[in-house]
């Protein structure tokens, strides 16, 4: 069987939505009303990896696009990017580690920890309209907590 994938949207703990900013970047900003249709819909795939009740390994692709969030070193720093893949081969159960995030849910908060770079998380800035990035600190200025809204496939 193919890997199971479910469609969802994400909002950070300040209720900012995620939208495309150019072909290979996401940004976070407050949306309402009709503008909500701009938000990115992810195809979240349940992939192979270490799993517990609170921690589930997932890959985050953009729905109906051959783009996946991935974590790579750039200038010696873990960096979040949107990576183009061959749609014939993705998604798959055994995703390369750079595509894998540990979806961690504790006390009403959802975090996405890079499997490739432990303790680095998908993050947004407090400021509006800034890029979504990989951050190495939790509980500081930057936001690492999200909510997830599942949508019909």
């Amino acid at each position: 069987a193919p890997v199971r994938s479910l469609n969802c949207t994400l909002r950070d703990s300040q209720q900012k939505s995620l939208v495309m900013s150019g072909p290979y970047e996401l940004k976070a900003l407050h949306l309402q009303g009709q503008d909500m249709e701009q938000q990115v819909v992810f195809s979240m795939s349940f992939v192979q990896g270490e799993e517990s009740n609170d921690k589930i390994p997932v890959a985050l692709g953009l729905k109906e696009k051959n783009l996946y969030l991935s974590c790579v070193l750039k200038d010696d720093k873990p960096t979040l990017q949107l990576e183009s893949v061959d749609p014939k081969n993705y998604p798959k159960k055994k995703m390369e580690k750079r595509f894998v995030f540990n979806k961690i849910e504790i006390n009403n908060k959802l975090e996405f920890e890079s499997a490739q770079f432990p303790n680095w998380y998908i993050s947004t800035s407090q400021a509006e309209n800034m890029p979504v990035f990989l951050g190495g600190t939790k509980g500081g200025q930057d936001i690492t907590d999200f909510t997830m809204q599942f949508v019909s496939s």
Partner: antibody
Framework: EVQLVESGGGVVQPGRSLRLSCSAS????????MSWVRQAPGKGLEWVAY????????YYPDSVKGRFTISRDNSKNTLFLQMDSLRAEDTGVYYC????????????WGQGTPVTVSS | DIQMTQSPSSLSASVGDRVTITCRAS??????LAWYQQTPGKAPKLLIY???TLMDGVPSRFSGSGSGTDYTFTISSLQPEDIATYYC?????????FGQGTKLQIT
């Protein structure tokens, strides 16, 4: 023994609100995703709301989106369904069920609470 | 959305009979299927998940099989207490949807 006990159903006029509760016991509530499933009179089953074990993930079908809100209080082992702008087609028995998105199936169910929307 | 079509919608059988209910999905659901039993005035009860895995405590006369889009639920020897409506439900993607039900009666 797992127990799910719903309450809060009743007769309400169209456009009004109702809040359902589900009290859980016999399992570690905070470790389980929960859902509400409804059954219109003489009809089949419809999944109407889902919340993940910590409360950070939710789902609503288009039929209730924007009108229903699911929430939970893990400290009190209680699940809620706030139903606003009720319509006649929301009439039915509402079941609290354990399970949802990740496992997919519903392995424990409450006895149900009836909701009637009528003028 | 994936639609689930159950057949028959109702059936009558005698105690001891072998009873079969089928469920067809409008798309491949890769075995992500559950079967429920609902007796009159009661909540549904999960019998089978992942198309063929029996829940703990469910009698072995109940079984499930199938793959792709076509699934079967079987009661090998019908008992009086099996009088109920049976529902299939897929959970391959969102929304998880139920079949319309099969009402089982004893002749």
């Amino acid at each position: 023994e797992v127990q799910l006990v719903e309450s809060g159903g009743g007769v309400v006029q169209p456009g009004r609100s109702l809040r359902l509760s589900c009290s859980a016991s016999g399992f570690i509530f905070s470790k389980y995703d929960m859902s509400w499933v409804r059954q219109a009179p003489g009809k089949g089953l419809e999944w109407v709301a889902y919340i993940s074990h910590g409360g950070a993930g939710t789902y609503y079908p288009d039929s209730v989106k924007g009108r229903f809100t699911i929430s939970r209080d893990n400290s009190k082992n209680t699940l809620f369904l706030q139903m606003d702008s009720l319509r006649a087609e929301d009439t039915g028995v509402y079941y609290c069920a354990r399970g949802g998105v990740y496992k997919g199936y519903f392995d424990e169910w409450g006895q149900g609470t009836p909701v009637t929307v009528s003028s | 959305d994936i639609q689930m079509t159950q057949s028959p919608s109702s059936l009558s059988a005698s105690v001891g009979d072998r009873v079969t209910i089928t469920c067809r999905a409008s798309g491949n659901i890769y075995g992500w299927l559950a079967w429920y039993q609902q007796t009159p005035g009661k909540a549904p009860k999960l019998l089978i998940y992942q198309a063929k895995t029996l829940m703990d405590g469910v009698p072995s006369r109940f079984s499930g099989s199938g793959s792709g889009t076509d699934y079967t639920f079987t009661i090998s020897s019908l008992q009086p207490e099996d009088i109920a409506t049976y529902y299939c439900q897929h959970f391959w993607n969102i929304p998880a949807t139920f079949g319309q039900g099969t009402k089982l009666q004893i002749t």
